[in-house]
Amino acid sequence: YPNASPLLGSSWGGLIHLYTATARNSYHLQIHKNGHVDGAPHQTIYSALMIRSEDAGFVVITGVMSRRYLCMDFRGNIFGSHYFDPENCRFQHQTLENGYDVYHSPQYHFLVSLGRAKRAFLPGMNPPPYSQFLSRRNEIPLIHFNTPIPRRHTRSAEDDSERDPLNVLKPRARMTPAPASCSQELPSAEDNSPMASDPLGVVRGGRVNTHAGGTGPEGCRPFAKFI
């Protein structure tokens, strides 16, 4: 199965938003200034993220406005931290066969989730919808992001991403274009596209689950239509 994720290159520039999606709704992961992490039904300045891809499928997720790294404690709680701890603030990224992405802690094995329950990631599992993420480009004007990215204490302050945290100077395209069948972006409420004017559009159905028991890999299901 081709890797459709935009996150697995050595670096993927620009701001993105991670969101969960079911047939009727979506929640964007946001990292607040106080470190609280939750979901919002729409893109916000706190859901604008930078995702740094590292070796072996690891990613580092940063909230641009909160200037906090997404981290996880030993109980599986996710939170935003100004300090980068490699054990708590790096996540293993995996694209499921249905085109959705999951992130789990290599240290504690829990999934990043917008739901309150803490669940360990098991290969081949079918996680609940609030633990499966899609990514969408940022649609919030850059003027709202007049703030530096947090310094990663284990790296040089002269790193490219430090000097141009929003990647406005040299924007990059997606490393691997998403195949239409599996990684197509959904319109958001803020889009002005024709699809957004009909956000429910009869675009596609909801989650297609090809295995009733939820133990094997899912098929490449159409993405949900949501509001």
Epitope: T22, R24, P41, A117, P129, N209, H211, A224, I227
Partner: antibody, heavy 117, light 106 residues
Amino acid sequence: QVQLVQSGAEVKKPGASVKVSCKASGYTFTNHYMHWVRQAPGQGLEWMGIINPISGSTSNAQKFQGRVTMTRDTSTSTVYMELSSLRSEDTAVYYCARDAVDAFDFWGQGTMVTVSS
Amino acid sequence: AIQLTQSPSSLSASVGDRVTITCRASQGISSALVWYQQKPGKAPKLLIYDASSLESGVPSRFSGSGSGTDFTLTISSLQPEDFATYYCQQLYDDFDFGPGTKVDIK
């Protein structure tokens, strides 16, 4: 604390419309979708639709397409559900419920709508 | 659409009994299942989310289990205030409810 307070009971004639309100307090209104669920006398719970509080976009159960209109007023943190072309089988208690990603965690007290000629 | 079936549709039990209610989904829904309790004239009350997580403030005699298609709500020792109707709901695709299980006094 989170509260969802609904408008009072209504009696309507067949063919008329009814508009039920649900005022939210105790949380950031625009951070949670809101649902409408109804329950006919002696029957189970029936999901009607959902509204995005920031954009006002809605999605309704197929059964109610064309008859239900959900709106919101962010200035007063209130959502509304209007059901048109009422018939006797629409007699039910109508609830608003807050979406908490993994459950409907808070519910309004319910609004009884009676459709009778 | 995913259909939920609950069994039994009603049951009679005594205070102190162990009560088990099952909910079956027509296709796999992972752990995206919720249980509610409803008493006459009242709004539903959240008991269990994500199939097995107890909502804050809910007594520990309530527990949920299951994943995929088969789920269970268990009341370890039925109390007088537990006589009510219980509904399951799936959040995997849409927001469908099960038909409910009424627990009444034997």
